[in-house]
């Protein structure tokens, strides 16, 4: 029951997270005009990954797409790529996890297959969440760098009394949506991996050995001790996990792919 709940919750949390990652990627407010120096501007600028917008006091909003690939900063391209990879992995993860759900019966699918699928989707959600967090963090870092650079030369003198104010940008709503969504996807992925441990069938190479004691026979089975120490009295139905060496190996080999995060 706890395994089903953990798996179900992991799926729902990941679903919300991936929906958030998609929303953040599509949002226009990745960076918004900093109003500290001019809180009463009649023109408000904000930018997304795909277009930049201007909202005027008149209520008119004008957005322009970035109709170039080569002319865009490499960092922006990297952020786009990270977000898209995150969405794709997340979507595949969702698809896999639907079939892996314990509450859904598909033909005569083995529990071991469901466990593998749960683990696969969990890892996909973890990578998806990390991609989103990395993408948003790279963009945030880019904003911070640009913010302080533009602060250093806030006013560019144009002779005499004339001033031209450089527009500074600060964190937009999409960044916070992205961070939260990435975190949720990551948590969902971890929950799926935890659920996988509970789904994995008992894998043992040992046969039950009978020892004959005087008067009555007691059967000792591997795992029987665990069953008798509060891990569940029904040893026949209980799947006891052996510590998960396989999963641990996968988890250990994973971070090396993403050392840059």
């Amino acid at each position: 029951m706890a395994v089903t709940a953990c798996q179900g919750l992991g799926f729902v949390v990941s679903l919300i997270g991936i929906a958030g990652i998609i929303a953040a990627t599509c949002m226009d407010q990745w960076s918004t005009q900093d109003l500290y120096n001019n809180p009463v501007t009649a023109v408000f600028n904000y930018q997304g990954l795909w277009r930049s917008c201007v909202r005027e006091s008149s209520g008119f909003t004008e957005c322009r797409g970035y109709f170039t690939l080569l002319g865009l900063p490499a960092m922006l391209q990297a952020v786009r790529a990270l977000m898209i990879v995150g969405i794709v992995l997340g979507a595949i993860g969702l698809l896999v996890s639907i079939f892996a759900l314990k509450c859904i019966r598909i033909g005569s699918m083995e529990d071991s297959a469901k466990a593998n699928m749960t683990l696969t989707s969990g890892i996909m959600f973890i990578v998806s969440g990390l991609c989103a967090i990395a993408g948003v963090s790279v963009f945030a870092n880019m904003l911070v760098t640009n913010f302080w650079m533009s602060t250093a030369n806030m006013y560019t003198g144009m002779g005499g009394m004339v001033q031209t104010v450089q527009t500074r940008y600060t964190f937009g709503a999409a960044l916070f949506v992205g961070w939260v969504a990435g975190g949720l996807t990551l948590i969902g992925g971890v929950m799926m991996c935890i659920a996988c441990r509970g789904l994995a069938p008992e894998e043992t190479n040992y046969k039950a050995v009978s020892y004959h004691a005087s008067g009555h026979s007691v059967a000792y089975k591997p795992g029987g001790f665990k069953a008798s120490t509060g891990f569940g009295s029904n040893t026949k139905n209980k799947k006891i996990y052996d510590g998960g060496a396989r999963t641990e190996d996968e988890v250990q080999s994973y971070p090396s792919k993403h050392d840059y995060v």
Epitope: N38, T41, A42, S52, V54, S57, G59, R64
Partner: antibody
Framework: EVMLVESGGGLVKPGGSLKLSCAAS????????MSWVRQTPEKRLEWVAT????????YYLDSVKGRFTISIDNGKNTLYLQMSSLRSEDTALYYC?????????????WGQGTSVTVSS | DIVMTQSPSSLSVSAGQKVTMRCKSS????????????LAWYQQKLGQPPKLLIY???TRESGVPDRFSGSGSGTDFTLTITSVQAEDLAVYYC?????????FGAGTKLELK
């Protein structure tokens, strides 16, 4: 046809109050940002206040902040300017103006104005 | 606040003549987000409210004759009337539409010789 008709002006003593109204017709009133602009006896144009269509944000000229209040009644299609603690420098012809939606914040329609005289 | 300075304060011209008036702002009215200038030109005839002629520094408002044209960017702007007509006699104001307070210039009075 777009029409803006101001009313409520008159002669008032310094420190007194007055409420100006601007009845709008011929357009979807709640889709536009509205402003009050005054013209001094020296013919200088001075923006007074604006109420935006998005969020109903209000902006005021520093010299009228805390004394004037801009508001709208969408049901009546009317823009108001509540003026209190009036000073002699507030004497002017007060225009109600509509900010055009695609005119880069420029005011595309103006009323005929209502005169406010602050004098003892 | 952005200060708008108009020059000359008055112009005396003959009908058919080309006329140019200038407007200078203390701060750039060019928005980096869309590369548009937030400056408007108004015409005010005696006893009438101001009428919008040009917005965005160079876009003519609908119904405005094509003899009126606006140009300039950043801090320096120009209103040109290619062939002045008698009905063009008025006071012309420029306005900052970029930042509150939405300041106006003192105006340029166009008179007939």
């Amino acid at each position: 046809e777009v029409m803006l008709v101001e009313s409520g002006g008159g002669l008032v003593k310094p420190g007194g109050s007055l409420k100006l109204s601007c009845a709008a017709s011929g357009f979807t009133f709640n889709s536009y940002t509205m402003s009050w602009v005054r013209q001094t006896p020296e013919k200088r144009l001075e923006w007074v206040a604006t109420i935006t269509v998005i969020g109903g944000n209000t902006y005021y000229l520093d010299s009228v902040k805390g004394r004037f209040t801009i508001s709208i009644d969408n049901g009546k299609n009317t823009l108001y300017l509540q003026m209190s603690s009036l000073r002699s420098e507030d004497t002017a012809l007060y225009y109600c103006a509509r900010m055009g939606q695609t005119q880069r914040n420029a005011m595309d329609y103006w009323g005929q104005g209502t005169s406010v005289t602050v004098s003892s | 606040d952005i200060v708008m300075t108009q020059s000359p304060s008055s112009l005396s011209v003959s009908a058919g003549q080309k006329v140019t008036m200038r407007c200078k702002s203390s701060q750039s009215l060019l928005n980096s987000g869309n590369q548009k200038n937030y400056l408007a030109w108004y015409q005010q005839k005696l006893g009438q409210p101001p009428k919008l002629l040009i917005y965005g520094a160079s876009t003519r408002e609908s119904g405005v004759p094509d003899r009126f044209s606006g140009s300039g960017s950043g801090t320096d702007f120009t209103l040109t009337i290619t062939s002045v007509q008698a009905e063009d006699l008025a006071v012309y104001y420029c306005q900052n539409d970029y930042s509150f307070p939405l300041t106006f210039g003192a105006g340029t009075k166009l008179e007939l010789k």
